[in-house]
Interface confidence: medium
Amino acid sequence: KSSNEATNITPKHNMKAFLDELKAENIKKFLYNFTQIPHLAGTEQNFQLAKQIQSQWKEFGLDSVELAHYDVLLSYPNKTHPNYISIINEDGNEIFNTSLFEPPPPGYENVSDIVPPFSAFSPQGMPEGDLVYVNYARTEDFFKLERDMKINCSGKIVIARYGKVFRGNKVKNAQLAGAKGVILYSDPADYFAPGVKSYPDGWNLPGGGVQRGNILNLNGAGDPLTPGYPANEYAYRRGIAEAVGLPSIPVHPIGYYDAQKLLEKMGGSAPPDSSWRGSLKVPYNVGPGFTGNFSTQKVKMHIHSTNEVTRIYNVIGTLRGAVEPDRYVILGGHRDSWVFGGIDPQSGAAVVHEIVRSFGTLKKEGWRPRRTILFASWDAEEFGLLGSTEWAEENSRLLQERGVAYINADSSIEGNYTLRVDCTPLMYSLVHNLTKELKSPDEGFEGKSLYESWTKKSPSPEFSGMPRISKLGSGNDFEVFFQRLGIASGRARYTKNWETNKFSGYPLYHSVYETYELVEKFYDPMFKYHLTVAQVRGGMVFELANSIVLPFDCRDYAVVLRKYADKIYSISMKHPQEMKTYSVSFDSLFSAVKNFTEIASKFSERLQDFDKSNPIVLRMMNDQLMFLERAFIDPLGLPDRPFYRHVIYAPSSHNKYAGESFPGIYDALFDIESKVDPSKAWGEVKRQIYVAAFTVQAAAETLSEVA
């Protein structure tokens, strides 16, 4: 029997019942419960929370809830030997030291086990030397320094401001520039919104606040010691020298009070332009070294953190499907936090908890989804997406055959202005249709749909009357599912106004001040934005698990493929002479995109007309839709990034958080004018065009009539 026959409830009624059961008050209660103490990965507190969630999901009515544990490489400060940075005089005396901890927020003064700010996976070391200010430490910042300003970072300690790109990319760039240490700091220009008070009086970063975070360059590998395979009881582990993605130079984060002390003495070159100036009252001189009076003073780092193999725990809950139990729709978000996790991750975990409760309520009333829904509370996301990646590595054979979709559920909010969605093009129509059915929580949009407020506040730059939906990048737990396994994925949260708020992320990200009170007082007192995000995430899961025909539209992939092909062609056409010299043609790619467009259009017509009462034909059509995302996977992966296997999308090589389209071609073209062997470089461009064209054509053929 189908799930609808089993319960005599119409699909529309089911969806309404599911959405109506979601309550803002419950999300608020769960958030409070999850944020009273730190839940750092690998700690007893986080293990206890895993067991609590396991127990509650069982009570909510899931069919089974299991813990999946792995032993992975984590990183912690040395409790008796703290990390800090000092300014030393010519005699080696420390004349200034950075703070050892953040001043705790009101009400949390007596909480134990608050990990002090540190850069996870930094090696130990005590380098000393002259300082060079490198702006955001982006690729283009080092180009400016090295090529235009002729400033050599070799043997220097660099200081970079957080923001714009993933911190691991900053560290990689500094290493490649020859730096011997990296200091990361939060500049008020990026983490202090004008007209807003510092925490606890507002949502801005105080001068003593510091952003924690890992500085790995894993490129999708998961546990650094067991790339490609689960870190289970019988795992073979690499030696630390062969571990994937570890930084080779000491790194440490500081707040802007401490940064002021380091930057105010900087001498050497003036900043190249205004884009290198933040908001501190310092000259933002690049260096190297301190100015005249202080030229004999140096900076010294003291880093004593250790890397340790530690047990982590995922919670995996199952709600078995009534009709297609071997088709999995996954809702996952992480549980581990740097400190209290008021936003990251518990604003997401609280939403997942309420979604599980609502599904459980329906199940207790006799309903089941058509397909199986898996719920996951991931561990060690903050240490490199480790919990999700290890679980996916362990279950990769099942997932690649049975995985329909993955919906991510980290932070539900990063602002309270409008919706933000990043997803596969296959989900565009699902998101549009769902948000048209949901009420907007926004002031001034009472009685209007979420789609309407979202479109007004975040319009598509291309299609009038439609909202912006972005590419998936990385930096979160969907990575292994989408970039490695090719499972259709999406994420949704409430965001800030990107027009007026230029700061990076939200100001208190990964600081001790990310508390329950931050959310309850300043971001979402009524929890109405959390509820809306629960409705979007839960509604997507509901539709993906319950609709008879999968709610994927392959025509939307055709549209973006054409756009991405146009974009990469235009990048290449900046080098018309070389294109001619090396006979570089994009004809094969444009031809493949054209074929994909035509075949997708015909498939969509067949999808309207086929006999949905024939279970074999229905399953066949759904399988073609499910496996379309999989068809974009190249088993050989991208050059030097074997776990990034999606040919259409990958995290940018210059910013893990951002998505890049046709990444193989893009990387081959990047800075090609500086390559020592142009013939080889353009040969690689041609090879990447070939791989892309073949993959698009092969994907198109999966949508053709089967015989």
Partner: nanobody, 119 residues
Framework: QVQLQESGPGLVKPSQTLSLTCTVS??????????WSWVRQHPGKGLEWIGF???????HYNPSLKSRVTISVDTSKNQFSLKLSSVTAADTAVYYC???????????RGQGTLVTVSS
């Protein structure tokens, strides 16, 4: 850091053509993946999208203004322009040029310039 600056007359007579230019500094206007757009804000109202030119040359206009709008680009000067014909008092607004892109955070806007339509 890319910066945008609008320039043009602040006063235009009814039925004439409003002409504005946006100068882009700190980055190339032919940089792939970006949309160079014009938007306007009537006094006390929200932003209204006028149109944009994509890096590959394709141009899109707001359907309600399409018959009166022309957007063009001069890559040699790193500028793009707006022409709005047959203006009326209803076209009085602050006009902004902007850069947009596929991703969040790509959006940049100029300071804006007030254009008043009056005889």
């Amino acid at each position: 850091q890319v910066q945008l600056q609008e320039s043009g007359p602040g006063l235009v007579k009814p039925s004439q053509t409003l002409s504005l230019t946006c100068t882009v500094s700190g980055g190339s206007i032919s940089n792939s993946g970006y949309y160079w757009s014009w938007v306007r804000q009537h006094p006390g109202k929200g932003l209204e999208w006028i149109g944009f030119i994509y890096y590959n040359g394709s141009i899109h206009y707001n359907p309600s203004l399409k018959s009166r709008v022309t957007i063009s680009v001069d890559t040699s000067k790193n500028q793009f322009s707006l022409k709005l014909s047959s203006v009326t008092a209803a076209d009085t607004a602050v006009y902004y040029c902007a850069r947009d892109g596929d991703d969040y955070g790509d959006y940049l806007r100029g300071q804006g310039t007030l254009v008043t339509v009056s005889s």
